[in-house]
């Protein structure tokens, strides 16, 4: 216990707890993909621990592995709606500094209405991810159908 | 380094390692759309640490953000019969106590049979988690199929 | 405060930040439905910290519950092709030691062409987790499309 | 092992329709799909359809009018049809099958070499 | 459709000497990771017989000396050395849509 001890302690603002979950804000103008969030707990369940948004989009605070996921819901969908809009595909990435850009996580919705995942990626302070859905169909602003958000895991 | 000695250190029971896994025990009776889980190692490799089940629902022991995440499975299934029986949904949120009662997280089953989604949420303590499912076809029970669980994240 | 101080403290390397995110490498052979996977830097976002890769297998190093995730994308795959093609199941499995093998997390695609779910899971020293795709789809080798990751999160 | 053995008549007159059966072992119908390929005297090789494992079928463009493929899973027997058949059809005609992985041919039948003459 | 064109349309290669057959496609048939290119091998009388799956995976019991290469829309067959059972037909074939398209074929003759 004493040999325990004598390792090196970890202080809690080092556990790097940095979280967020954001909740839909609105869609991007005409050829902007891009999905703009929102986040606070002035707006329900949302909410950012260390990561910031930036014009919509998230903002990572300190380096590590992240463990990203999102949900994201078609609105007013059945599948044949999505099959009838096909290809609608949602790409989670890294859009900003442009030197380190590229795509992280990618589904198709096919013939369903809703995609959900979520994967550990190496981010560092100052990327930027963008969540971009091409389409045509409008994705669900209700806060349990769709949502995204990051969790830090270690350095 | 003797400056991060100095900071406060973080003790292992503060941690807040509250997890759970769980696996499907059965459906509600008639008019209750609940689903009925179960844990621990006697069952398999669900287990409960922290979070304790009432009447086959979550109920969590210590406030913090957690991932929540969910798998369900329909029994008997393909992409024909969950189209017949449509919609089929899943939804999980807050039961109780009634004036923290809200959604969490919803899916609809469309022309898939599986359903597996997971997400960053704050709970506090006594919140009881239910998981609804609308529609008529059984989930399945298989361990591997069908699971339900949540992780203790940050304060 | 004192009383804090005077608890267990956690030393950093006792925390247990076994995490791994992998990039699919190659199928297997002929009656051999094990997908191959690969990590590390030099690969792109892929990387192994505490689980090791066994002849394209991940193998666990440290006790503990951990988060197991996956997504696996078919290639060339519309929802037509998906059932054309069924049934296609992954499933995630220990399939080392032989006495601990057992079957985690288990999907069928159905009418989609991707499948990504995560549960968390006792794993001990030494199990080897194999994922088996059965059906005559390949899987996308796409990084954003197919990956596979552990993560630990406690004792 | 997986085989798979052809039968069939091997003159047609034209204007007639050709029937051939693709009987198959070592695998079931209901995992994998049989294709079917022709090659034309002197020429390359030309795909003409598939029946998927489901029962699901795909047809060349070029023959969707005139051909049908069925099949019988309990039987492991595969059914090829192709109507109003004229000279330039003549040709050898294939079934073969995939393993493990769909997207090229692993296994072939030996062959029918179809003949349409009068 | 996506058109093979293969050439040489033959080609005569002294035994022992390297044998190259080329595969151009209309379009890529690269996606996903994979290049969906394949080559057979045929014989007067018998069906043709797979060498490579996926522009470069030599098929089961098929001597090393025949190699695949290539990605997106060219394609490479080698054989080398090349032998006299080698004499045969050389087909390439795509598989990244519907429908699945064969090359003219290169015969190719042993000096």
């Known amino acids: 216990q004493r040999f325990a001890q004598a390792q090196q302690q970890l202080p809690l603002e080092s556990l790097g707890w940095d979280v967020a979950e954001l909740q839909l804000n609105h869609t991007g103008p005409q050829q902007d993909p891009r999905l703009y969030w929102q986040g606070g707990p002035a707006l329900g369940r949302s909410f950012l621990h260390g990561p910031e948004l930036d014009k919509g989009q998230l903002r990572i605070h300190r380096d590590g592995i992240y463990m990203v996921h999102i949900q994201v819901t078609l609105a007013i969908c059945s599948s044949t709606t999505a099959s009838r809009h096909h290809p609608t595909t949602l790409a989670v990435g890294i859009c900003s500094p442009a030197s380190r850009s590229i795509s992280l996580l990618r589904l198709s919705f096919h013939q369903g209405c809703t995609i959900a995942s979520q994967r550990l990626t190496p981010l560092a302070r100052g990327d930027t991810l963008c969540t971009n859905l091409t389409g045509t169909l409008l994705p669900s602003r209700n806060t349990d159908e769709t949502f995204f958000g990051v969790q830090w895991v270690r350095p | 380094q003797r400056f991060a000695q100095a900071q406060q250190q973080l003790p292992l029971e503060s941690l807040g390692w509250d997890v759970a896994e769980l696996q499907l025990n059965h459906t509600g009776p008639q008019q209750d759309p609940r689903l009925y889980w179960q844990g621990g190692p006697a069952l398999g490799r669900s287990f409960l640490h922290g979070p304790e089940l009432d009447k086959g629902q979550l109920r969590i022991h210590r406030d913090g953000i957690y991932m929540v995440h969910i798998q369900v499975t329909l029994a008997i299934c393909s992409s024909t019969t969950a189209s017949r029986h449509h919609p089929t949904t899943l939804a999980v949120g807050i039961c109780s106590p009634a004036s923290r009662s809200i959604s969490l997280l919803r899916l609809s089953f469309h022309q898939g049979c599986t359903i597996a989604s997971q997400r960053l949420t704050p709970l506090a303590r006594g919140d009881t988690l239910c998981t609804n499912l609308t529609g008529t076809l059984l989930p399945s029970r298989n361990t591997d199929e069908t699971f339900f669980g949540v992780q203790w994240v940050r304060p | 405060q004192r009383f804090a101080q005077a608890q267990q403290q956690l030393p950093l390397e006792s925390l247990g930040w076994d995490v791994a995110e992998l990039q699919l490498n190659h199928t297997g052979p002929q009656q051999d439905p094990r997908l191959y996977w690969q990590g590390g830097p030099a690969l792109g976002r892929s990387f192994l910290h505490g689980p090791e890769l066994d002849k394209g297998q991940l193998r666990i190093h440290r006790d503990g519950i951990y988060m197991v995730h996956i997504q696996v994308t078919l290639a060339i795959c519309s929802s037509t092709t998906a059932s054309r093609h069924h049934p296609t199941t992954l499933a995630v499995g220990i399939c080392s030691p032989a006495s601990r093998s057992i079957s985690l997390l288990r999907l069928s695609f159905h009418q989609g062409c991707t499948i990504a779910s995560q549960r968390l899971t006792p794993l001990a020293r030494g199990d080897t987790l194999c994922t088996n795709l059965t059906g005559t789809l390949l899987p996308s080798r796409n990084t954003d499309e197919t990956f596979f990751g552990v993560q630990w999160v406690r004792p | 092992q997986v085989q798979l053995k052809q039968s069939g008549p091997g003159l047609v007159q034209p204007s007639q329709s050709l029937s051939i059966t693709c009987t198959v072992s070592?695998?079931?119908?209901?995992?994998?799909?049989v294709h079917w390929v022709r090659q034309s005297p002197g020429k390359g090789l030309e795909w003409l359809g598939v029946?998927?494992?489901?029962?699901?079928?795909d047809y060349n463009a070029a023959f969707i009018s005139r051909l049908s493929i069925s099949k019988d899973n309990s039987k492991s027997q595969v059914f090829f049809k192709m109507n109003s058949l004229q000279a330039n059809d003549t040709a050898i005609y294939y079934c073969?099958?995939?393993?493990?992985?769909?997207?090229?041919?692993?296994?072939w039948g030996q062959g029918t070499l179809v003949t349409v003459s009068a | 459709d996506i058109v093979l064109t293969q050439s040489p349309a033959s080609l005569a290669v002294s035994l022992g000497q390297r044998a190259t057959i080329s595969c151009r496609a209309s379009?890529?048939?690269?996606?996903?990771?994979?290049?969906?290119m394949h080559w057979y091998q045929q014989k007067p009388g018998q069906p043709p017989k797979l060498l490579i799956y996926l522009a470069s995976n030599l098929e089961s019991g098929v001597p090393a000396r025949f190699s695949g290469s290539g990605s997106g829309t060219d394609f490479t067959l080698n054989i080398h050395p090349v032998e006299e059972e080698d004499a045969a037909t050389y087909s390439c074939q795509h598989s990244r849509e519907l429908p699945w398209t064969f090359g003219g074929g290169t015969k190719l003759e042993i000096k």
């Open positions: 073969a099958t995939y393993y493990r992985y769909d997207g090229w041919f692993a296994y």
């Open positions: 029946i998927w494992s489901g029962g699901s079928t």
């Open positions: 070592g695998f079931s119908l209901t995992s994998y799909g």
């Open positions: 379009k890529s048939v690269s996606t996903s990771g994979y290049s969906y």
